[in-house]
């Protein structure tokens, strides 16, 4: 046995359309064959659950249907993309990831990705 | 605000079973794996089992395979352990805990106590 | 599974003093995954650290953990009368999750 490590960028800045992608990889220390990913938001000592997913290796990552998270699985690898914020959702987002099957479960939790969302500009009236 | 409150726990026999639950409330029961951990009288914490989520994967330590059942009723907000083939040194106060967010066991019951004596 | 191991046993100190408690882990723990909690006699446990080092919520400043690989410390930098107890690490990253067997923090 040995700690799962899961890595993911330190910054990433949402598109103006406020969608933010970012990939979390995880080092495998078993043949897992049912993966958990969850993107958490801290936010001063408070944790909040943005989207969580369980996939099979080797299938397509499904979020819920109301999901505000997508994303994809390739490997080790998980491409997460997270929609519809606003400047107010900036912060920290944390990819957590379990091994849930089979025996044993491997909890990994990455440093976090600083998501920094800008309001775009409301155009201005035009006059003709 | 969460709250943990477990019963069932009293005196049975060697080999006799008993069912613990554990009622949950004040967050979203379905969103949180839950622990059984005890404690024999005087002694440390063992961890005992966990469900996860939705129900589908449970992890137990080696003392109780075989022996005892982890199960969660989403529907009551409730957890059960239900165990079987009871030994002098199950007994103990069983305490049901929730695993938070980042996977600790952020709350606890005040725990309810089994005792297996003949 | 991973065994956990704290130091000293028993820690007899007198209010106003530092306690320094030690846990060491029988295999590389993630730091993410390494918690401290405290009990009082006839209460349940009450999470103090998760992550090594994050107080969890309404956890007084005084009360702090460091380390990572296979060494930890929870620190109290200045023991209160209510902080006499004992108090446990535990990981939480590999199932089955193990705790150390505690270290008593008395009164001198």
């Known amino acids: 046995c040995k700690a799962m490590h899961v890595a993911q960028p330190a910054v990433v800045l949402a598109s103006s359309r406020g969608i933010a992608s970012f990939v979390c990889e995880y080092a495998s220390p078993g043949k897992a064959t049912e993966v958990r990913v969850t993107v958490l938001r801290q936010a001063d000592s408070q944790v909040t659950e943005v989207c969580a997913a369980t996939y099979m290796m080797g299938n397509e990552l499904t979020f819920l249907d109301d999901s505000i998270c997508t994303g994809t699985s390739s490997g080790n690898q998980v491409n997460l993309t997270i929609q519809g914020l606003r400047a107010m959702d900036t912060g920290l987002y944390i990819c957590k990831v379990e091994l849930m099957y089979p025996p044993p479960y491997y909890l990994g939790i990455g440093n976090g990705t600083q998501i920094y969302v800008i309001d775009p500009e409301p155009c201005p009236d035009s006059d003709f | 605000q969460v709250q943990l409150v477990e019963s069932g726990g009293g005196v049975v026999q060697p080999g006799m079973s008993l069912r613990l639950s554990c009622a949950a409330s004040?967050?979203?029961?379905?969103?949180?794996?839950m622990h059984w951990v005890r404690q024999a009288p005087g002694k440390g914490l063992e961890w005992v089992a966990v469900?996860?989520?939705?129900?589908?994967?449970?992890h137990y330590a080696d003392s109780v395979k075989g022996r005892f059942t982890i199960s969660r009723d989403s529907s009551k907000n409730t957890l059960y352990l239900q165990m079987n083939s009871l030994r002098a040194e199950d007994t103990a106060v069983y305490y049901c805990?929730?695993?938070?967010?980042?996977?600790?066991?952020?709350?606890w019951g005040q725990g309810t106590l089994v005792t297996v004596s003949s | 599974e991973i065994v956990l191991t704290q130091s000293p046993g028993t820690l007899s100190l007198s209010p106003g003093e530092r306690a320094t408690l030690s846990c060491r882990a029988s295999q590389s723990v993630s730091s993410s995954c390494l918690a401290w909690y405290q009990q009082k006699p006839g209460q349940a446990p009450r999470l103090l650290i998760y992550g090594a080092s994050s107080r969890a919520t309404g956890i007084p400043d005084r009360f702090s953990g460091s380390g990572s690989g296979t060494d930890f410390t929870l620190t109290i930098s200045r023991l209160e009368p209510e902080d006499f107890a004992v108090y446990y690490c535990?990981?939480?990253?590999?199932?089955?999750?193990?705790f150390g067997p505690g270290t008593k923090v008395d009164i001198k």
């Open positions: 004040g967050f979203t029961f379905s969103s949180y794996g």
């Open positions: 805990a929730r695993g938070g967010r980042l996977g600790a066991f952020d709350y």
């Open positions: 535990q990981q939480y990253g590999i199932s089955p999750f193990t």
């Open positions: 469900i996860w989520y939705d129900g589908n994967n449970r």
